[in-house]
């Protein structure tokens, strides 16, 4: 697993330099969680054919992942910084109950998935402590994850493998719109 | 496990309709798709229609919209498959399938349970 931000020899190497700002911090969790996406889409992709004809192969996702839309403050266009923050976390938290199906669904990138789901953690409070409107984020209800994750692990293994290709495709594109938006904030 | 098990085939001329039945038993509770496959002989398994076991929705290949419908009986746990306007080309064994999941397939690697099949004739 590539090590986490923060932690790679040129930092250790060079202590004269400037701390990370907030925002840098942010920025650099993201770009570190979508390497390690990036890492374990690969393995998927070269493990089945899931990557190419994952449209055609099905009649309905009900998955229900997490997806910005223009009502959510992020983009351009209707930009709104609190709306937007508050989104990115709310977000972030529907994501764990699918980052934590990922975890044994990788064969030789096991470590990578781990790495995954931990920075998001970490990224989710670094988000916490810049959000003014906590209030308005909305944790997801533990019964009704531990419900899914048995939904999930139930389905046969093509549909797994299909759900991982789902979840990371979903959380790769997710992670991209809030770098986008956070570097406008 | 979830049997599944078709009838209502047979021997039709082209034109006509046939009403085929798939009867699912065991642990249907846990059904979230319920779907119909075809194989002609030496040809691949193909995939006819699915269904959203709860909500009902259903789905077509291009090949039989607008002449087969899926319907179900949820109290019999009972798939139907009303095929209209036959042709020829829809002479095979025709498949029931069953599958739990947040995912509906319409590729047969989606399904778990499998039906023996029933054997439709279309004749010109």
């Known amino acids: 697993a590539p090590v986490p931000p923060g932690e790679d020899s040129k930092d250790v190497a060079a202590p004269h330099r400037q701390p990370l700002t907030s925002s840098e911090r942010i920025d650099k969790q993201i770009r570190y969680i979508l390497d390690g996406i990036s890492a374990l889409r690969k393995e998927t992709c070269n493990k089945s054919n899931m990557c190419e004809s994952s449209k055609e192969a099905l009649a309905e996702n009900n998955l229900n992942l997490p997806k910005m839309a223009e009502k959510d403050g992020c983009f351009q266009s209707g930009f709104n910084e609190e709306t937007c923050l508050v989104k990115i976390i709310t977000g972030l938290l529907e994501f764990e109950v699918y980052l934590e199906y990922l975890q044994n669904r990788f064969e030789s990138s096991e470590e990578q998935a781990r790495a995954v789901q931990m920075s998001t953690k970490v990224l989710i409070q670094f988000l916490q402590k810049k959000a003014k409107n906590l209030d308005a984020i909305t944790t997801p209800d533990p019964t009704t994850n531990a419900s899914l994750l048995t939904k999930l692990q139930a389905q046969n293994q093509w549909l797994q493998d299909m759900t991982t290709h789902l979840i990371l495709r979903s959380f790769k594109e997710f992670l991209q719109s809030s770098l986008r938006a956070l570097r406008q904030m | 496990q979830v049997q599944l098990v078709e009838s209502g085939g047979g021997l039709v001329q082209a034109g006509d309709s046939l009403r085929v039945a798939c009867a699912a038993s065991g642990r249907t509770f846990s059904i979230d798709a319920m779907a119909w496959f075809r194989q002609a002989p030496g040809k691949e398994r193909e995939f006819v229609s699915t269904?959203?076991?709860?909500?009902?929705?259903?789905y077509y290949a291009d090949s039989v919209k607008g002449r087969f419908t899926s319907s179900r009986d949820n109290a019999k746990s009972t798939s139907y498959l009303q095929m209209n306007s036959l042709k020829p080309e829809d002479t095979a064994v025709y498949y029931c399938a069953a599958a739990r999941g947040l995912l509906i397939a319409t590729d047969a690697r989606g399904y778990d349970y499998w039906g023996q099949g029933t054997q439709v004739t279309v004749s010109s």
């Open positions: 269904m959203n076991w709860s909500t009902g929705a259903t």
